[in-house]
């Protein structure tokens, strides 16, 4: 099966790599614009130069193209705790990331929020914090894992999943309560 090509892809595939078909004259192949530039005017004829102009401040193109406008630079989302790793240039978009000892949680494909890595208090680090994943903690005896924090078994209620992990402690508490003096 042949994959469905959009009109632009169909037109481009007629020309050799690095060129595109003239929108008004399909017998002419124009040279694409370099990254950091955009198409101002199509080439007037075969072998003649395409009129490409440099992107203005606040915009970019990251690959060769025949776009009529440069793309707007992304802005890091402060409300998501994002910080700017590198600023936008004419040929590269802004790179956003998180601070040290933070990880990214992706709410959607292109939107992430920064969260502090768990410190595993009352436990040990099973897997270190990574760019896109929080620390994985293992809790000490007498503690259970709740929302990636080690919580004392004294906070374990019978209905919670912690009962298996905290069973010895719960039994001990019961035992001390039940053992009366004769």
């Amino acid at each position: 099966l042949v994959p469905h090509l959009g009109d632009r892809e169909k037109r481009d595939s007629v020309c050799p790599q690095g060129k595109y078909i003239h929108p008004q004259n399909n017998s002419i192949c124009c040279t694409k614009c370099h990254k950091g530039t955009y198409l101002y005017n199509d080439c007037p004829g075969p072998g003649q130069d395409t009129d490409c102009r440099e992107c203005e401040s606040g915009s970019f193109t990251a690959s060769e193209n025949h776009l009529r406008h440069c793309l707007s630079c992304s802005k890091c989302r402060k409300e998501m705790g994002q910080v700017e790793i590198s600023s936008c240039t004419v040929d590269r978009d802004t790179v956003c990331g998180c601070r040290k000892n933070q990880y990214r949680h992706y709410w959607s494909e292109n939107l992430f929020q920064c969260f502090n890595c768990s410190l595993c208090l009352n436990g040990t680090v099973h897997l270190s914090c990574q760019e896109k994943q929080n620390t994985v903690c293992t809790c000490h005896a007498g503690f259970f894992l709740r929302e990636n924090e080690c919580v004392s078994c004294s906070n374990c209620k019978k209905s919670l999943e912690c009962t298996k992990l905290c069973l010895p402690q719960i039994e001990n508490v019961k035992g001390t309560e039940d053992s009366g003096t004769t």
Epitope: H105, Y106, W107, S108, E109, N110, L111, Q113, F115, N134, E147, N148
Partner: nanobody
């Protein structure tokens, strides 16, 4: 078939509280980010809050931060929104949505919250 059914809306006085619930079915609830989105009368949609599959990560819009709390119970396939210190500007239809950020693929039918004295 994915179904999201909100409940818990109603009329409340300013400063009051409400707890919204969303019963989910037809997909593996515990594997997805979930959100609350609202639409005030005559306004656009506002992403209010989101929670990660584990519940470890949460997001709140500035307009509700410190007043609203999102939570989930994966054993019951239910999403919650505890709304405290309600204001007139919180009046809206509240929708439960599968996904978050710029990617909501399913919505509930909504529940109306009216804050008025």
């Amino acid at each position: 078939e994915v179904q999201l059914l909100e409940s818990g809306g109603g009329l409340v006085q300013p400063g009051g509280s409400l707890r919204l619930s969303c019963a989910a079915s037809g997909f593996t609830f515990s594997a997805y980010n979930m959100s609350w989105v609202r639409q005030a009368p005559g306004k656009g949609l506002e992403w209010v809050s989101a929670i990660s599959p584990s519940g470890n990560e949460t997001y709140y819009a500035d307009s509700v931060k410190g007043r609203f709390t999102i939570s989930r119970d994966n054993s019951k396939n239910t999403l919650y929104l505890q709304m405290n210190s309600l204001r007139a500007e919180d009046t809206a239809v509240y929708y439960c949505a599968k996904g978050a950020g710029e990617a909501f693929d399913y919505w509930g039918q909504g529940t109306l919250v009216t804050v008025s004295s």
